[in-house]
């Protein structure tokens, strides 16, 4: 039975041209994390494999940096970066946990972080 919970940074906003950290955290399970995939609307951004390390998709090499931890840093944000991001935790023996983050990239200088929330 899958008992874990993914906690994410939730709905967040950031300024155009700035950067943002996407963070997920898996809790309430003793399952081993074998890999974390980061996706933007079905497109692979990055992989963090427990044995082999990070892979940043060639399409995003110039604007995505690994970390901190299992998180992902998006740089040089544009309004086109607005949308859903998913952290997909592959674990053993539980299986797959998915967390969702919605990022809004704002033209204005006012960008506030939303509240944290959980996806079971």
């Amino acid at each position: 039975m899958m008992t874990g919970t993914i906690e994410t940074t939730g709905n967040i906003s950031a300024e155009k041209g700035g950067s943002i950290i996407l963070q997920c955290h898996l809790s309430s399970t003793t399952a081993q994390v074998t890999q974390v995939n980061w996706e933007q609307q079905d497109q692979l951004l990055a992989i963090c494999n427990a044995d082999l390390g990070w892979h940043i998709s060639p399409s995003f090499k110039d604007r995505v940096a690994p970390g901190p931890g299992l998180g992902l840093t998006l740089q040089s944000l544009t309004v086109n970066d607005t949308g859903e991001y998913f952290c997909i935790y592959h674990t053993y023996p539980d299986g797959t946990y998915t967390g969702r983050i919605f990022l809004e990239v704002l033209e204005s200088s006012v960008a506030e972080h939303g509240a944290r929330f959980q996806i079971p």
């Epitope: 497109q43 692979l44 390390g53 990070w54 892979h55 060639p58 090499k61 690994p66």
Partner: antibody, heavy 122, light 113 residues
Framework: EVQLVQSGAEVKKPGSSVKVSCKAS????????IGWVRQAPGQGLEWIGD????????NYNEKFKDRVTITADKSTSTAYMEFSSLRSEDTAVYYC???????????????WGQGTLVTVSS | DIVMTQSPDSLAVSLGERATINCKSS????????????LAWYQQKPGQPPKLLIY???TRESGVPDRFSGSGSGTDFTLTISSLQAEDVAVYYC?????????FGGGTKVEIK
């Protein structure tokens, strides 16, 4: 020992499709990319696309995007490349490759299948 | 797309002599985060699939003789065979794996003079 074993040679008519398989062994299939590269007779190497089985993420060369579908079956550690609307100029040896594109190892296409000759002729 | 240009197209070298193959990319292959150039070299003998020789510009694949070496950075790269052996007769390809689509040079045929 890492091995990539491809299906046998094919002869196809123009306009038809071909599906080539690539069975991987000797490593964790989900952890590495499987790519497809072709080589026309006497010519150089051309990258078609790849798949990451640990998420089924695919990337295609725009030149082939409308005619190629790459899939993977994790249960059998087998990747497939289906090429449609074949033309005579698609006659080539098609290779599958294992790709290591991690930022800490980055060994590129470190293992290659033996190749599958696809001949397109009327 | 990144264009990979190899030179020369063919090369005839005496046994025991040095062979040098050049490869130029239309864009830099240097990834600033890990300071690695995403450039590989392959050897292909007649009737065989290509074989990885060198990755990240200069790292020899396991089992590759040390007479093969790679150098360069950014857009200009070189494969050197320090002392050509009969078994080195082959076609050599450079390849970038920095960005999609991955692309190869046109190949350099190395023969014995």
């Amino acid at each position: 020992e890492v091995q990539l074993v491809q299906s046998g040679a094919e002869v196809k008519k123009p306009g038809s499709s071909v599906k080539v398989s690539c069975k991987a062994s000797g490593y964790t299939f989900s952890n590495y990319w499987i790519g497809w590269v072709r080589q026309a007779p006497g010519q150089g190497l051309e990258w078609i696309g790849d798949i990451y089985p640990g998420g089924a993420y695919t990337n295609y060369n725009e030149k082939f995007k409308d005619r190629v579908t790459i899939t993977a079956d994790k249960s059998t550690s087998t990747a497939y490349m289906e090429f449609s609307s074949l033309r005579s100029e698609d006659t080539a040896v098609y290779y599958c490759t294992r790709g290591d594109y991690y930022d800490s190892s980055g060994r590129a296409m470190d293992y290659w299948g033996q190749g599958t000759l696809v001949t397109v002729s009327s | 797309d990144i264009v990979m240009t190899q030179s020369p197209d063919s090369l005839a070298v005496s046994l025991g002599e040095r062979a040098t193959i050049n490869c130029k990319s239309s864009q830099s292959l240097l990834y600033s985060r890990n300071q690695m150039n995403y450039l590989a070299w392959y050897q292909q003998k007649p009737g065989q699939p290509p074989k990885l020789l060198i990755y990240w510009t200069s790292t020899r694949e396991s089992g590759v003789p040390d007479r093969f070496s790679g150098s360069g950075s950014g857009t200009d790269f070189t494969l050197t065979i320090s002392s050509l052996q009969a078994e080195d007769v082959a076609v050599y390809y450079c390849q970038q794996y920095y960005s999609y689509p991955y692309t190869f040079g046109g190949g350099t045929k190395v023969e014995i003079k």
